[in-house]
């Protein structure tokens, strides 16, 4: 058993049929010595008396808010949560496996630049009695500070019969050094509590590996005289690291119709303009990627050919 | 070339060669990008590689003030990786695929380090840790880790030379 926060404790249980469970001793936070009784949750049934209560925690029925009283007055609370371990593996029931970029990916994180600011998000089908708490650091043995905000519900979507909820959090490295080569990964730890179930999820990454620039901005077209060709120009996204002579992007320019199966024109360039062939009912799209490190491409920025 | 007196390197040549190094580092093992090597433990194996750190003057302001500190750091890293790629970690079993770009990568690391340091002048170089994995699978894992680390190192070096070529070239 360990303390998650004041008056909230996590009991780690090996979860299998007829498991013996864990013996837990609760102590009432009071100078009083006698006349103390214990109850669980809303029940008025007295579970025991005395300054300490010894319980065998085997299942969720044994978890909850234990309260010690004296003469009708509440002295203190201890909330017990369960953390299940099945076949040596901690449960991951609360969050959905996003399976990208690999199986058992519960947390996904992205950064728009090298400033040390990043966003992580996760998915769940649970709508109520759910809380998250996020901590982060650079490195684990001698951790350097990363400050995370509160996790918020950022999107809801329907998936078949189920509703899916996306939560996200923004974090900022306290002393970021955008130009340096990272040697210690960022660690992100999410505590998830659903009713009386506790789970924790972690992710470890270098900012450079989660970079995904915003799409290029200000796409403009200039038809070339006596030609089917069009000069398309764009600018670096505002959120990208500066100076651009140091933090350079490379671009992919594509002309394609509405269907992915349609024919296309495609060209890669390090410049902020390119000449392509425009077709009726097609769109010109441009996306960006770090020029020197193969992290994710941005989403496409698009303008219609006409 | 970056010489003791602090004269400028051939920024544009360095830029071209460092960009080539980036391409080669990724083609040497693109799949490395999909392996989460941190899960494999054994962190100390690549902890000894020289990293371009915050105080090394490789940021735009540091380069403007005095690019020598940064160039020396890059040179150290190039020599370090060049020796690693020539060591039995890469030459031993399992043999590299014949079409592996590691050979080109090795040659390009040497080429860029020579651009930075002409004959006759020697910056101090970092000791190569004695990494001699006994098992072929350990060697394979170590190769992946070294290449992954090299990808990050050459990316920073390429940014430095691109910025230098754009803003510091005479």
């Amino acid at each position: 058993i360990w303390e998650l926060k004041k008056d909230v404790y996590v009991v780690e249980l090996d979860w299998y049929p007829d498991a013996p469970g864990e013996m837990v001793v609760l102590t009432c936070d009071t100078p009083e010595e006698d006349g103390i009784t214990w109850t669980l949750d809303q029940s008025s049934e007295v579970l025991g008396s005395g300054k300490t209560l010894t319980i065998q925690v085997k299942e969720f029925g044994d978890a909850g808010q234990y309260t010690c009283h004296k003469g009708g007055e509440v002295l203190s609370h201890s909330l017990l949560l369960l953390h299940k371990k099945e076949d040596g593996i901690w449960s991951t029931d609360i969050l959905k496996d996003q399976k990208e970029p690999k199986n058992k990916t519960f947390l996904r994180c992205e950064a728009k630049n090298y400033s040390g600011r990043f966003t992580c998000w996760w998915l769940t089908t649970i709508s109520t009695d759910l809380t998250f708490s996020v901590k982060s650091s650079r490195g684990s043995s001698d951790p350097q500070g990363v400050t995370c905000g509160a996790a918020t519900l950022s999107a809801e979507r329907v998936r078949g019969d189920n509703k899916e909820y996306e939560y996200s959090v923004e974090c900022q490295e306290d002393s970021a050094c955008p130009a340096a080569e990272e040697s210690l990964p960022i660690e992100v730890m999410v505590d998830a509590v659903h009713k009386l179930k506790y789970e924790n999820y972690t992710s470890s990454f270098f900012i450079r590996d989660i970079i995904k620039p915003d799409p290029p901005k200000n796409l403009q077209l200039k038809p070339l005289k006596n030609s089917r060709q069009v000069e398309v120009s764009w600018e670096y996204p505002d959120t990208w690291s500066t100076p651009h002579s140091y933090f350079s992007l490379t671009f992919c320019v594509q002309v394609q119709g509405k269907s992915k199966r349609e024919k296309k024109d495609r060209v890669f360039t390090d410049k902020t303009s390119a000449t392509v062939i425009c077709r009726k009912n097609a769109s010109i799209s441009v996306r960006a990627q770090d020029r020197y490190y193969s992290s994710s491409w941005s989403e496409w920025a698009s303008v219609p050919c006409s | 070339r970056a010489v003791p007196g602090g004269s400028s390197p051939a920024w544009t040549q360095c830029q071209q060669l460092s960009q080539k190094l980036c391409t080669l580092a990724w083609s040497a093992h693109p799949l490395v990008g999909h392996m989460d090597l941190r899960e494999e433990g054994d962190e100390e194996t690549t902890n000894d590689v020289p990293h371009i750190q915050c105080g090394d003057g490789c940021d735009p302001q540091g380069l403007r003030d005095n690019s020598q500190f940064c160039l020396q750091r890059i040179h150290q890293g190039l020599i370090f990786y060049e020796k690693l790629l020539g060591s039995d970690i890469f030459t031993g079993e399992p043999s590299l695929l014949p079409d592996s770009p590691v050979g080109q990568l090795h040659a390009s690391l040497l080429g860029l380090s020579q651009l930075l340091q002409p004959e006759g002048h020697h910056w101090e170089t970092q000791q190569i840790p004695s990494l001699s994995p006994s098992q072929p699978w350990q060697r394979l894992l170590l190769r992946f880790k070294i290449l992954r680390s090299l990808q990050a190192f050459v990316a920073v070096a390429a940014r430095v030379f691109a910025h230098g070529a754009a803003t510091l070239s005479p």
Epitope: T250, R261, K263, R266, V267, I277 | -
Partner: antibody, heavy 118, light 107 residues
Framework: QVQLVQSGAEVKKPGASVKVSCKAS????????LHWVRQAPGQGLEWMGW????????EYAPKFQGRVTMTTDTSTSTAYMELRSLRSDDTAVYYC???????????WGQGTMVTVSS | EIVMTQSPATLSVSPGERATLSCRAS??????LHWYQQKPGQAPRLLIY???QSISGIPARFSGSGSGTEFTLTISSLQSEDFAVYYC?????????FGGGTKVEIK
């Protein structure tokens, strides 16, 4: 499978014109760009231009501008390349080539030998 | 127009050996570079597109790398059917241009 079959060899006199055909099969004709590339005997490859069979749009290499015309007949899934004012240095194998991507060549015809000789 | 230069013009290699073919562009073309193989009396065949992307059906011994102005086609272990002429082609801008070719012959 995607296939391009070209017309047979031609012998022409200097100053004449030649029209080479390229019949496509195995795909929807308008779904691919069509290019013409030529190769003089013992020489390398030279791109002449492209046509979009969907709308007849063309782009020719400057070297051939004014002397070449590329057309298509969607009813027969056939592309044509006409080269006028032939000279002896136009002697070459003429290939049609196609792709969904405009700028490189995925599928090639077998080639048509055009000999220009007096 | 962009001029593509291939070297060497002829490469003599023994079967089973590795062949490295070079292609240089007269200006930076990013990764807009494609490789073709042509055997005598046949049309060219696409091997690699956008510098390093492999084509299904093309043996894995063919690989491409490079960006900017310098590109390489590597044939890891030459088979008898690989002796042919290899062309690079840039697609950075029109007109599309090819290199002069590298003939890979049996040593």
């Amino acid at each position: 499978q995607v296939q391009l079959v070209q017309s047979g060899a031609e012998v022409k006199k200097p100053g004449a014109s030649v029209k080479v055909s390229c019949k496509a099969s195995g795909y929807t004709f308008t779904d691919y760009y069509l290019h013409w590339v030529r190769q003089a005997p013992g020489q390398g490859l030279e791109w002449m231009g492209w046509i979009d069979p969907e709308n007849g749009d063309t782009e020719y290499a400057p070297k051939f501008q004014g002397r070449v015309t590329m057309t298509t007949d969607t009813s027969t899934s056939t592309a044509y390349m006409e080269l006028r004012s032939l000279r002896s240095d136009d002697t070459a194998v003429y290939y049609c080539a196609a792709n969904k991507e405009l700028r490189y060549f995925d599928v090639w015809g077998q080639g048509t030998m055009v000999t220009v000789s007096s | 127009e962009i001029v593509m230069t291939q070297s060497p013009a002829t490469l003599s290699v023994s079967p089973g050996e590795r062949a490295t073919l070079s292609c240089r562009a007269s200006q930076s073309i990013s990764i807009n570079l494609h490789w073709y193989q042509q055997k005598p009396g046949q049309a060219p065949r696409l091997l690699i597109y956008f510098a390093s992307q492999s084509i299904s059906g093309i043996p894995a011994r063919f690989s491409g790398s490079g960006s900017g102005t310098e590109f390489t086609l590597t044939i890891s272990s030459l088979q008898s059917e690989d002796f042919a002429v290899y062309y690079c082609q840039q697609s950075n801008s029109f007109p599309l241009t090819f290199g002069g070719g590298t003939k890979v012959e049996i040593k």
